[in-house]
């Protein structure tokens, strides 16, 4: 049993059909000795007196939050969560499997630049009763700081028979060296409780692997004299990393017409404009990687060629 | 040339071939399958390479005060690859296909540390370790961790020579 | 899934006892609350008594006269049936439920339970 925050404690549960459970022993913060009774939840029946309760805890009927009284007088709460293992592996009921990029990936994480700011998501069909604070750090034995915000849910889908709802967190490091290589991961870990289950996640990744630029900006066409050429020009987008002279994008340009079946066109530019014909009724379209780090491309920016 | 005096490098010249390497590391190492190499327990074969570190004067301003710190720094990781991509994890088994980009890699790096480093002129290198796996599939992960972490530095080096050409060329 | 077996109903005489069991297996971490429940013929299945840890609740009907109780080890819940009237004739069903509310009095409502045993036959002769 350990401490998650302030009268909250998590029992782990290695749970096999036949396990014992756990025994755990509940003592009332108080200085006071003789007239004490327990409960549990919002029952008034009273489970046993005295200053401390041993219970066995075997399923998740056994946690709950357990309080100390006397004379009527609340003393103490102690609420008890489960973190349950079962054959040698911590259940992961409350988030979704995303499945990318690769199986059991259950926090996602990007950032735009290499400001050391990142922001990560996740995935439940679980609508009440939830709750998930986030810790962050740069490497491990000896961590250092990043800052987290409250996760928010996000969004909301519907799939299928199934409501979805995405929650985010924003992280910041503390002391962030956008130039420098980095050598220790950043570790984020989410705590997850769902009434009285409570389940733990991580992810572990270098800023490098997670940068996602935004879209180029102010994607605008000039259509060429006495040809059916336009020179097509972009801008960095504004929350990518200062200067563009260090930090570099490269782009790829793209002429699609109206039939996703029709040959798309592409270029790959180093520069913020490129010469492409357009054809009637196609669009122009630009995303941008890192020029020397192979992460993913942004989303596309588009334009009609008309 | 960098000369350890203090003079410039052919900033234009060292981008371009940064620029390159950035390419044939990523043609030797693709993202294989998002194949997590961190999760391999690698601390004792890549925590010995040379990164570039905060410290170290890489960044724009650090550049503009005095390249040579970065400059020192990015030669000692060129070498210290170099010898790696020389040494029996590439050059044992399984062997390489014929057409790997290792061996251009492993030339370009060459390259580039001569472009910072004349002859006759010597920086301090870092030693490289003892890495001598037995089994050919240790040496494999192995290939896979030293790319993935060259990735990385030749990235830092490629923006430092890129921002050198545009912002300290004479 | 969560399995439930009842077992120990007959016939007894009228002010006589008996003791039923209902033996879980299956994924029973998942449990929150265990009942029993009875139907006579004729009429709808209703609530006898519910247990969750150390909490018991009954039904006005059977307070003082049955005691719910839970063997952890065993993963068994037991309704002893003392002084039994011909009115406790019926099949009793032991159920389960995997859902938390933390009002233990919800664990007397039928739907609050998503597993149910195939139910044992009790019958007093008067």
């Known amino acids: 049993i350990w401490e998650l925050k302030k009268d909250v404690y998590v029992v782990e549960l290695d749970w096999y059909p036949d396990a014992p459970g756990e025994m755990v022993v509940l003592t009332c913060d108080t200085p006071e000795e003789d007239g004490i009774t327990w409960t549990l939840d919002q029952s008034s029946e009273v489970l046993g007196s005295g200053k401390t309760l041993t219970i066995q805890v075997k399923e998740f009927g056994d946690a709950g939050q357990y309080t100390c009284h006397k004379g009527g007088e609340v003393l103490s709460h102690s609420l008890l969560l489960l973190h349950k293992k079962e054959d040698g592996i911590w259940s992961t009921d409350i988030l979704k499997d995303q499945k990318e990029p690769k199986n059991k990936t259950f926090l996602r994480c990007e950032a735009k630049n290499y400001s050391g700011r990142f922001t990560c998501w996740w995935l439940t069909t679980i609508s009440t009763d939830l709750t998930f604070s986030v810790k962050s750090s740069r490497g491990s034995s000896d961590p250092q700081g990043v800052t987290c915000g409250a996760a928010t849910l996000s969004a909301e889908r519907v799939r299928g028979d199934n409501k979805e709802y995405e929650y985010s967190v924003e992280c910041q490091e503390d002391s962030a060296c956008p130039a420098a290589e980095e050598s220790l991961p950043i570790e984020v870990m989410v705590d997850a409780v769902h009434k009285l289950k409570y389940e733990n996640y991580t992810s572990s990744f270098f800023i490098r692997d997670i940068i996602k630029p935004d879209p180029p900006k102010n994607l605008q066409l000039k259509p060429l004299k006495n040809s059916r050429q336009v020179e097509v020009s972009w801008e960095y987008p504004d929350t990518w990393s200062t200067p563009h002279s260090y930090f570099s994008l490269t782009f790829c340009v793209q002429v699609q017409g109206k039939s996703k079946r029709e040959k798309k066109d592409r270029v790959f530019t180093d520069k913020t404009s490129a010469t492409v014909i357009c054809r009637k009724n196609a669009s122009i379209s630009v995303r941008a990687q890192d020029r020397y780090y192979s992460s993913s491309w942004s989303e596309w920016a588009s334009v009609p060629c008309s | 040339r960098a000369v350890p005096g203090g003079s410039s490098p052919a900033w234009t010249q060292c981008q371009q071939l940064s620029q390159k390497l950035c390419t044939l590391a990523w043609s030797a190492h693709p993202l294989v399958g998002h194949m997590d190499l961190r999760e391999e327990g690698d601390e004792e074969t890549t925590n010995d390479v040379p990164h570039i570190q905060c410290g170290d004067g890489c960044d724009p301003q650090g550049l503009r005060d005095n390249s040579q710190f970065c400059l020192q720094r990015i030669h000692q990781g060129l070498i210290f690859y170099e010898k790696l991509l020389g040494s029996d994890i590439f050059t044992g088994e399984p062997s390489l296909l014929p057409d790997s980009p290792v061996g251009q890699l492993h030339a370009s790096l060459l390259g580039l540390s001569q472009l910072l480093q004349p002859e006759g002129h010597h920086w301090e290198t870092q030693q490289i370790p003892s890495l001598s796996p037995s089994q050919p599939w240790q040496r494999l992960l192995l290939r896979f961790k030293i790319l993935r972490s060259l990735q990385a530095f030749v990235a830092v080096a490629a923006r430092v020579f890129a921002h050198g050409a545009a912002t300290l060329s004479p | 899934e969560v399995q439930l077996v009842e077992s120990g109903g007959g016939l007894v005489q009228a002010g006589g006892s008996l003791r039923l069991s209902c033996a879980s297996s299956?994924?029973?971490?998942?449990?929150?609350?265990r009942g029993w429940f009875r139907q006579a013929p004729g009429k709808e299945r209703e609530f006898v008594a519910a247990i969750r840890s150390g909490l018991t609740t009954y039904s006005d009907s059977v307070k003082g006269r049955f005691t719910i109780s839970r063997d952890i080890a065993k993963n068994t819940v037991f309704l002893q049936m003392n002084s039994l009237k011909s009115e406790d004739t019926a099949v009793y069903y032991c159920a389960a439920a995997v859902n938390y509310f933390t009002d233990f009095t919800d664990y007397s409502k039928r739907d609050s339970y998503d597993y149910w045993g195939q139910g044992t036959q009790v019958t007093v002769s008067s």
């Open positions: 299956g994924r029973t971490f998942s449990i929150y609350a």
